[in-house]
């Protein structure tokens, strides 16, 4: 029987700059029971603060309501180990809510063939950004990624679409169906997971007009 | 206890290209950005990039955006930092850097640096 | 870029001495300022981040103050481990940028 081994906070996000949540990795038990606190405190402040929600963000985990979650100041945190033989400590974690924000998938997307007369035909894709990001204040970037392939391929190929809700998409293979998803991630920040798919069917005579 | 080792000085002639390392442990890997720093002898710090290991997306200094190249190998714990064409003035120590948190750049634990030298 | 000039570019002190050294950024940076320690032959330590907020185990006689586009690191009263050369760091816009370093060095 042993101290417990020491734990570290490998992870937190935020769906929208109001709450977040941080998860932590177990260190060793020490072969008997052990309980764990995460304790944190403001940049500039001394006063520590305990977790005020163990619940909501599953096992090990810690989270952060809007009453506890303060955009442009850093929260200093650990955890603490505990079983009858002793105490771990993970390493002090730095965490600025404005950089762990993973926002929900891009909405409404929505797919569309153009065949102009005088040009080349294209893929037209268009989509939303997700409800819960304010764009309007300026605290948000967000940059969008396009993935699409014909049903049956086994790779993706992918298009950067920096700020801009819509894409043009020029060189597909005529007869196919394709299926295209979006994601969008803050300037700092992580990538949503990808859309639900939306499939289109690209029409045989898909092709440059002369 | 965490750690960033980086591979050993290399000597390259001008126009190749070097591939430095840098392998971290002591830490979940995934979770902060790695930044890349160069020293030229006796002069200041100079930031090359950054890479954020959990998907790979990296941002550049424009002066070396065409030439730096990083990359990340999650199941090593490894950062790359690669830069072709080489020239006399690319001589520099070359640091690997974590990113102090979940947050702004700044740098909590560095490398011990990788020495290159372009030389003809 | 924003260029941030480091004066003096060396400082020759005492042990015991209260040393000074700013920082000027070329544009507003608010508070996200880092300031780092190098040793000869050493990789750089991180002493202080967001202008005035001390690194985990960093001693209390460093301190900075400042906001905007002018910083001062202060070690209010120099040990012989301090003599070493300082560089500040702006982190905020791309790319991020130092300074060119202040030497500091026994009288």
């Known amino acids: 029987q042993l101290p417990p081994g020491k734990p570290e906070i490998f992870k937190c996000r935020s769906p929208n700059k109001e709450t977040f949540t941080c998860w932590w990795r177990p260190g060793t038990d020490g072969g008997l029971p052990t309980n764990y606190s995460l304790t944190y405190h403001r940049e500039g402040e001394t006063l520590m603060h305990e977790c005020p929600d163990y619940i909501t963000g599953g096992p090990n985990s810690c989270h952060f309501g809007k009453q506890y979650t303060s955009m442009w100041r850093t929260y200093i945190m650990m955890v603490n180990a505990t079983n009858q033989m002793g105490s771990s400590f993970s390493d002090e974690l730095y965490v600025d809510v404005t950089y762990i924000v993973q926002p929900d998938p891009p909405l409404e997307l929505a797919v569309e063939v153009k065949q102009p007369e005088d040009r080349k035909p294209y893929l037209w894709i268009k989509w939303s950004p997700p409800t819960l990001i304010d764009l309007k204040t300026g605290w948000f970037t967000l940059l969008y990624e396009i993935r699409l392939k014909p049903e049956k391929a086994a790779e993706w190929e992918i298009h950067f679409a920096g700020q801009q809700t819509e894409f043009k998409i020029l060189s597909l293979h005529p007869g196919q169906k394709y299926l295209v998803q979006v994601r969008c991630k803050p300037d700092h920040g992580y990538w949503s997971a990808w859309s639900p798919a939306t499939f289109i069917q690209i029409p045989s005579d898909f092709t440059m007009n002369d | 206890e965490v750690q960033l080792v980086q591979s050993g000085a290399e000597v390259k002639k001008p126009g190749s290209s070097v591939k430095v390392s840098c392998k971290a442990s002591g830490y979940t890997f995934t979770t902060y950005w790695m930044h890349w720093v160069r020293q030229a002898p006796g002069q200041g710090l100079e930031w090359i990039g950054e890479i954020d290991p959990s998907d790979s997306y990296s941002n550049y200094n424009q002066k070396f955006k065409d030439r730096a190249t990083l990359t990340v190998d999650k199941s090593t714990s490894t950062a790359y930092m690669e830069l072709s064409s080489l020239r006399s003035e690319d001589t520099a120590v070359y640091y690997c850097?974590?990113?102090?948190?979940?947050?702004?750049?700044?740098?909590?634990?560095w490398g011990q640096g990788t020495l290159v030298t372009v030389s003809s | 870029d924003i260029q941030m000039t480091q004066s003096p570019s060396s400082v020759s002190a005492s042990v015991g001495d209260r040393v000074t050294i700013t920082c000027k950024a070329s544009q507003y940076v608010g508070t996200a300022v880092a300031w780092y320690q190098q040793k000869p032959g050493k990789s750089p330590k991180l002493l202080i981040y967001?202008?005035?907020n001390r690194y985990t185990g960093v001693p209390s006689r460093f301190s900075d103050s400042g906001s905007g586009t002018d910083f001062t690191l202060t070690i209010s009263s120099l040990q012989p481990e301090d003599f070493a050369t300082y560089f500040c760091?702006?982190?905020?816009?791309?790319?991020?940028?130092f300074g060119g370093g202040t030497k500091v060095e026994i009288k």
């Open positions: 760091q702006q982190y905020s816009s791309y790319p991020w940028t």
């Open positions: 967001s202008a005035s």
């Open positions: 850097a974590r990113n102090g948190g979940l947050g702004p750049a700044w740098f909590s634990y």
